[in-house]
């Protein structure tokens, strides 16, 4: 057993048939020595009297609000929340395996460039009863400081039968510099809560590796003369980082109808234009990539060739 | 246009391509590195992120863009250690601070160089013969050492007497070209952006 | 399968014209480009232009502009390239090739050897 | 228009080992780069797309790297069937250009 925050309580526990549980041993946090009654939740039912309650907690029935009371009077609180780990494997429950870049993703982080902001998500299908708090620092043995906002709902969608619910964090770490080689990973720590469910999701990740640019800005067109070629022209996104001669972006350029199927005009460019050619009910399309360090291409800034 | 527009300083050139260069060799060895080593920890996720330049050099440092010189972040080691010149640049150009990141850069290579060949040396021996490094990325920093061409003492190359242990050395191998590929990107970074000033 | 299958050999004079044919099969003609190229005896590849079959839009390397003059029919999914004013330097192998990208070619034909000789 | 040189021209190799092919372009192309194979007689076959992307059906041991003005194709080990000419070609601007074409002889 150890303790999440003040008066809450994870007990940690081996999950299988017939499992003996875990003894766990609650202090009444009173001066008073006698004349004290235990209860759980809102049941009157008195579990046990004196300063200490000892408890056999085996199943989500014994976790829950214990709370010692003198004279109806109420003295203090602890709330039991349980952590479940099944052949040795802590339980996943709670958030969604979104599967990408690989199985076990449970968190997904990205940053718009290298000043140190960034953003994770999580989803789930679970909409009531359900708290997250996060810690993050960069490295693990001697940590060095990341602020982190309060998660929030970002986004609800529809799958199937299902609705889905997104949360997202923005954390900022304390010092960053942009132009910095990492050698210590950045540690996201998410504190999910379901019910009485305790679950711990991490993930560990250098800004380098989760850099995905803002779309190129300003997209524009200029037919040439004599010619089915068009110059399309375009700027970087204000979120990235400067100067943009250290912070170089590579560029692709695209032509293409409404249909992925469709044929197409691609060109990769380390400029701000390039040359490419409209074809009616087509768009041209941008996106943004670091020149030096493949992580991701931006989304697409798109307009349309006519 | 946000792209500083300047004309080329045609001293500087040679840099930059060659910095291109080596970025993508050694991007190169280390995609080829992770893919003969599959089973063994070769990965990011993997590896120990060394630096065996770290307390030697202060590339990151001495050739912050001035742009970052006001982010006290970006100042914390900032050293001056070398004072040396360069021919990558035209001498009446180079300031001293440019100086100092060139010749950072130089022994960042020669060290990296030094350790590459004494771990190449290594695994001739493996007799496995499952991995050697890429003559071109060898080529590659030399020709960079030689547009940069900064005079400094020889280092000589490390002999080892004992048997190597070729397992370890695979996985030195890795962390040294995981290291080596930041500070190309670092070095690419830097050519980039004098290249532009 | 797609295959794009060229007219046969031709022997033409100084001066006059060929009109080689590229029929496409496998996949809609009108959902890729169409290019001709020509590669001369011991040299390497030359690119002539695209067609987009779909709206009969074309483009040419400014080498051939006003020689040559592709065309296509997607009643029959069959390109043409016509070469006008023919010179012994035009002697080559003929090639259409198509993509659904612009600028490389996924699929070619097997070649048309033009001789120009008087 | 861009200028697509190769080298070498005649590249004998023996069988099982490694080959490089090198094609430079006279101005940056990005990774606007494309590579075929060309048996005697037969259409060119495209092996490697913008430079380093893979195309479905092409054995793994053909790969390509570069950026700018300088690019590489590598056959990791060479069998009996990949002895042809290569040949690179430019996708930056129009006209499309080639280079020469480097054949690949047994040794």
């Known amino acids: 057993i150890w303790e999440l925050k003040k008066d809450v309580y994870v007990v940690e526990l081996d999950w299988y048939p017939d499992a003996p549980g875990e003894m766990v041993v609650l202090t009444c946090d009173t001066p008073e020595e006698d004349g004290i009654t235990w209860t759980l939740d809102q049941s009157s039912e008195v579990l046990g009297s004196g300063k200490t309650l000892t408890i056999q907690v085996k199943e989500f029935g014994d976790a829950g609000q214990y709370t010692c009371h003198k004279g109806g009077e109420v003295l203090s609180h602890s709330l039991l929340l349980l952590h479940k780990k099944e052949d040795g494997i802590w339980s996943t429950d709670i958030l969604k395996d979104q599967k990408e870049p690989k199985n076990k993703t449970f968190l997904r982080c990205e940053a718009k460039n290298y000043s140190g902001r960034f953003t994770c998500w999580w989803l789930t299908t679970i909409s009531t009863d359900l708290t997250f708090s996060v810690k993050s620092s960069r490295g693990s043995s001697d940590p060095q400081g990341v602020t982190c906002g309060a998660a929030t709902l970002s986004a609800e969608r529809v799958r199937g039968d299902n609705k889905e619910y997104e949360y997202s964090v923005e954390c900022q770490e304390d010092s960053a510099c942009p132009a910095a080689e990492e050698s210590l990973p950045i540690e996201v720590m998410v504190d999910a809560v379901h019910k009485l469910k305790y679950e711990n999701y991490t993930s560990s990740f250098f800004i380098r590796d989760i850099i995905k640019p803002d779309p190129p800005k300003n997209l524009q067109l200029k037919p040439l003369k004599n010619s089915r070629q068009v110059e399309v022209s375009w700027e970087y996104p204000d979120t990235w980082s400067t100067p943009h001669s250290y912070f170089s972006l590579t560029f692709c350029v695209q032509v293409q109808g409404k249909s992925k199927r469709e044929k197409k005009d691609r060109v990769f460019t380390d400029k701000t234009s390039a040359t490419v050619i409209c074809r009616k009910n087509a768009s041209i399309s941008v996106r943004a990539q670091d020149r030096y360090y493949s992580s991701s291409w931006s989304e697409w800034a798109s307009v349309p060739c006519s | 246009r946000n792209l500083p527009v300047a004309t080329p300083d045609p001293g500087m050139f040679p840099c930059l391509h060659h910095s291109q260069n080596l970025l993508r060799a050694v991007s190169n060895m280390l995609q080829k590195a992770r893919q003969t080593l599959e089973f063994y920890p070769c990965t990011s996720e993997e590896i120990d992120h060394e630096d065996i330049t770290k307390d030697k050099t202060s590339t990151v440092e001495a050739c912050l863009p001035l742009e970052l010189t006001k982010n006290e972040s970006c100042l914390n080691s900032r050293e001056t250690s070398f004072i040396t010149n360069g021919s990558c640049l035209a001498s009446r150009k180079t300031s001293f601070m440019m100086a100092l990141c060139l010749s950072s850069i130089y022994e960042d290579l020669k060290m990296y160089q030094v350790e590459f060949k004494t771990m190449n040396a290594k695994l001739l021996m493996d007799p496995k013969r499952q991995i050697f490094l890429d003559q071109n990325m060898l080529a590659v920093i030399d020709e960079l050492m030689q547009a940069l061409n900064f005079n400094s003492e020889t280092v000589p190359q490390k002999s080892s007497l004992e048997e190597p242990d070729f397992y370890k050395t695979k996985i030195k191998l890795c962390i040294l070209l995981h290291a080596f590929r930041i500070r190309a990107v670092t070095i690419d970074r830097v050519m980039s952006y004098l290249n532009a000033s | 399968q797609v295959q794009l299958v060229q007219s046969g050999a031709e022997v033409k004079k100084p001066g006059s014209s060929v009109k080689v044919s590229c029929k496409a099969s496998?996949?809609?003609?009108?959902?890729?480009?169409l290019h001709w190229s020509r590669q001369a005896p011991g040299q390497g590849q030359e690119w002539m232009g695209w067609?987009?079959?779909?709206?009969?839009?074309?483009e040419y390397a400014p080498k051939f502009q006003g020689r040559v003059t592709i065309t296509a029919d997607e009643s029959t999914s069959t390109a043409y390239m016509e070469l006008s004013s023919l010179r012994s330097e035009d002697t080559a192998v003929y090639y259409c090739?198509?993509?659904?990208?612009?600028?490389?070619?996924?699929?070619w034909g097997q070649g048309t050897l033009v001789t120009v000789s008087s | 228009d861009i200028v697509m040189t190769q080298s070498p021209l005649s590249l004998p190799v023996t069988p099982g080992e490694p080959a490089s092919i090198s094609c430079r372009a006279s101005?940056?192309?990005?990774?606007?780069l494309h590579w075929y194979q060309q048996k005697p007689g037969q259409a060119p076959r495209l092996l490697i797309a913008?430079?380093?992307q893979s195309i479905s059906g092409v054995p793994s041991r053909f790969s390509g790297s570069g950026s700018g003005t300088d690019f590489t194709l590598t056959i990791s080990s060479l069998q009996p069937e990949d002895f042809a000419t290569y040949m690179c070609?430019?996708?930056?601007?129009?006209?499309?250009?080639f280079g020469q074409g480097t054949k690949v002889e047994i040794k």
């Open positions: 496998g996949g809609t003609f009108s959902d890729y480009y």
């Open positions: 101005q940056s192309i990005s990774i606007n």
């Open positions: 067609i987009d079959p779909e709206n009969g839009d074309t």
């Open positions: 070609q430019q996708s930056n601007s129009f006209p499309l250009t």
């Open positions: 913008f430079a380093s």
């Open positions: 090739a198509r993509n659904k990208e612009l600028r490389y070619f996924d699929v």
